[in-house]
């Protein structure tokens, strides 16, 4: 059936970058400026995305692919295909409805985006605190108290078994 249809349908021969022009006896016409078709057999070309305002062009539109946008400096992409741009904050801050606000004590954000997260509670993980956290980074936990007791081995432990998705150290 597919083969029969393709023999009957001249539009199936139109490659990406063209469209099947019904106004011209279904011959393949190139996509007009500022439009594209990414697959063959299209009856229309799609309008190219325009990167305006806070968006800037990361990849120009071509006859076979849409333009790609990213965000101007001071903003970062959100959503599929960078559908939105959100204001950057400094490390140690998070974006609120009232703008960028410093992380509350006991929380940190080590990126220019996202929310402030609580410091790790080392004791919950059976660890001691090596260096306290700041607004910009998490606490660094140290060895477990058991490792510090008299008679504990000071020898470097063997490397743990490698977990899936982690390269060996």
């Amino acid at each position: 059936f597919e083969r029969t249809r393709s023999l009957q349908d001249p539009c199936s021969n139109c490659p990406a970058g063209t469209f099947c022009d019904n106004n011209r006896n279904q011959i393949c016409s190139p996509c007009p400026p500022n439009s594209f078709s990414s697959a063959g057999g299209q009856r229309t070309c799609d309008i190219c995305r325009q990167c305006k305002g806070v968006f800037r062009t990361r990849k120009e539109c071509s006859s076979t692919s849409n333009a790609e946008c990213d965000c101007t400096p001071g903003f970062h992409c959100l959503g599929a295909g960078c559908s939105m741009c959100e204001q950057d904050c400094k490390q140690g801050q998070e974006l609120t409805k009232k703008g960028c606000k410093d992380c509350c004590f006991g929380t940190f954000n080590d990126q220019k985006r996202g929310i402030c997260r609580p410091w790790t509670n080392c004791s919950l993980d059976g660890k001691s605190v090596l260096v306290n956290g700041t607004k910009e980074r998490d606490v660094v936990c140290g060895p477990s108290p058991a490792d510090l007791s008299p008679g504990a081995s000071s020898v470097t432990p063997p490397a743990p078994a490698r977990e899936p998705g982690h390269s060996p150290q």
């Epitope: 080392c122 090596l130 700041t134 660094v140 936990c141 060895p143 490792d147 432990p157 150290q169």
Partner: nanobody, 125 residues
């Protein structure tokens, strides 16, 4: 793997100074923080000082504040402990320690603590 080698320990008199070094080798790129722990005879090992490798932020045990200074040279993968105005109670085996990852490391699949073999510091009167 990370290997740590301490040096600089010895016998000194009270009030003297000493500088310990800890040279790291191996996968040093993975080290987040390093520290000095000490273990007096028959006692628990205790944190003396620690430093974040990236920003140099430090943490000191109260009893050494103002006397000891921890520093690092990232280019040489070496950490130092400058110990001034040494006291009898500073006598201990001093261990170099290195940590990979922030927090407990558990979320990143890291659970790596590395220790040196220790260097003896003895302060006499």
């Amino acid at each position: 793997q990370v290997q740590l080698q301490e040096s600089g320990g010895g016998l000194v008199q009270a009030g003297d100074s000493l500088r310990l070094s800890c040279a790291a080798s191996g996968s040093t790129f993975s080290i987040t923080a390093m520290g000095w722990y000490r273990q007096p005879p028959g006692k628990q090992r205790e944190l003396v000082a620690a430093i974040i490798m990236s920003d140099g932020d430090t943490n000191y045990q109260d009893s050494v504040k103002g006397r000891f200074t921890i520093s690092r040279d990232n280019a040489k993968n070496t950490m130092y402990l400058q110990m001034n105005s040494l006291k009898l109670e500073d006598t201990a085996v001093y261990y170099c320690y290195a940590r990979t990852g922030y927090g407990s490391g558990r979320l990143m699949g890291h659970e790596y603590d590395y220790w040196g073999q220790g260097t003896q510091v003895t302060v006499s009167s």
